[in-house]
């Protein structure tokens, strides 16, 4: 059974983890450049079900694409520091979804822009944060 | 206990630069991100933006972006808020604030002529 | 940017009386709102988290309540030292947005 501190660990997690997307969802709405166009037109897979920790293996597997697409928006007014911001979550994703079970990601039949990819996984770690609070 | 101390009073000129400094004490300094906070004399709260202290990337307000860095030092748990171009508008109190619920004593920044 | 929309701006109370102010989020935050209360030359004291979760160490005769756009922080019977200026604030999405504050005063 889960102990008080370990629910105090996952909550913080999940909530550094909400904060990195909140963080990279607000350089992209601050985004002022004819690359962000360019950016919309990647697509991300969403996952067919995201209630639990285990179903971040989906976020996991799409980290890689999401550095690449950050990595287009390098200005000076792009603060974030994509492999330092992607490397961050990667560490916290897979501390939270744990690595003793092997989950098979299912994904959505529709992709998805980088702005509707955050907002998904943005509202699954408000979704569980809340259900800890 | 859980504590912030920011850097003293500053007065500065219209097109200066200012840095305000924020010093956490009595938690794991990397557990909580840090928020920056102003407000004008008289006026409501309004969000500057957001450090992650343990990887040092930053989020800010579009009202701020262009004008202000926020950047941490591990070593000594504190981080540190530069705003420049200043104008007589930045008059303010500025609070850092971590996770939002303890917070600073308050940095007057004065931007006069 | 959510605009978030306290009413009253102003109020006048007496020790002892209810005090209730409103918040209304211009879309929908679910509970990610807090209460903060203020007295000048002071940062702001966290009240009320969760929209409803009150802080530790704050008395029970503040609450709060609500979800979605519409919300509600409670002083059951004021007190002395609960003459200040309350605001709300929603971490539902970036940037972070207050009310414009609601300053009680004393009748």
């Known amino acids: 059974a889960p102990t008080s501190s370990s629910t105090k660990k996952t909550q913080l997690q999940l909530e550094h983890l909400l904060l990195d997307l909140q963080m990279i969802l607000n350089g992209i709405n601050n985004y002022k450049n004819p690359k962000l166009t360019r950016m919309l037109t990647f697509k991300f897979y969403m996952p067919k079900k995201a209630t639990e920790l285990k179903h971040l293996q989906c976020l996991e597997e799409e980290l890689k694409p999401l550095e690449e697409v950050l990595n287009l928006a390098q200005s000076k007014n792009f603060h974030l520091r994509p492999r330092d911001l992607i490397s961050n979550i990667n560490v916290i994703v897979l501390e939270l979804k744990g690595s003793e079970t092997t989950f098979m990601c299912e994904y959505a039949d529709e992709t998805a822009t980088i702005v509707e990819f955050l907002n998904r996984w943005i509202t699954f770690c408000q979704s569980i944060i809340s259900t800890l609070t | 206990q859980v504590q912030l101390v920011q850097s003293g009073a500053e007065v500065k000129k219209p097109g200066a630069s200012v840095k305000v400094s924020c010093k956490a004490s009595g938690y794991t300094f990397t557990d909580y991100y840090m928020h920056w906070v102003r407000q004008a004399p008289g006026q409501g709260l309004e969000w500057m933006g957001i450090i992650n202290p343990r990887a040092g990337y930053t989020s800010y307000a579009l009202k701020f972006q262009g004008r202000v860095t926020m950047t941490r030092d591990t070593s000594t748990s504190t981080v540190y808020m530069e705003l420049s171009s200043l104008r007589s508008e930045d008059t303010a109190v500025y609070y850092c604030?971590?996770?939002?619920?303890?917070w600073g004593q308050g940095t007057l920044v004065t931007v006069s002529s | 940017d959510i605009q978030m929309t306290q009413s009253p701006s102003s109020l006048s109370a007496s020790v002892g009386d209810r005090v209730t102010i409103t918040c209304r989020a211009s879309?929908?935050?679910?509970?990610?709102l807090a209460w903060y209360q203020q007295k000048p030359g002071k940062a702001p004291k966290l009240l009320i988290y969760?929209?409803?979760s009150l802080q530790s160490g704050v008395p029970s005769r503040f609450s709060g309540s609500g979800s979605g756009t519409d919300f509600t922080l409670t002083i059951s019977s004021l007190q002395p030292e609960d003459f200040a200026t309350y605001y709300c604030q929603q971490s539902y999405s970036f940037p972070v947005t207050f009310g414009q504050g609601t300053k009680v005063e004393i009748k």
């Open positions: 879309q929908s935050i679910s509970t990610w």
């Open positions: 969760a929209a409803s």
């Open positions: 604030t971590s996770g939002m619920d303890v």
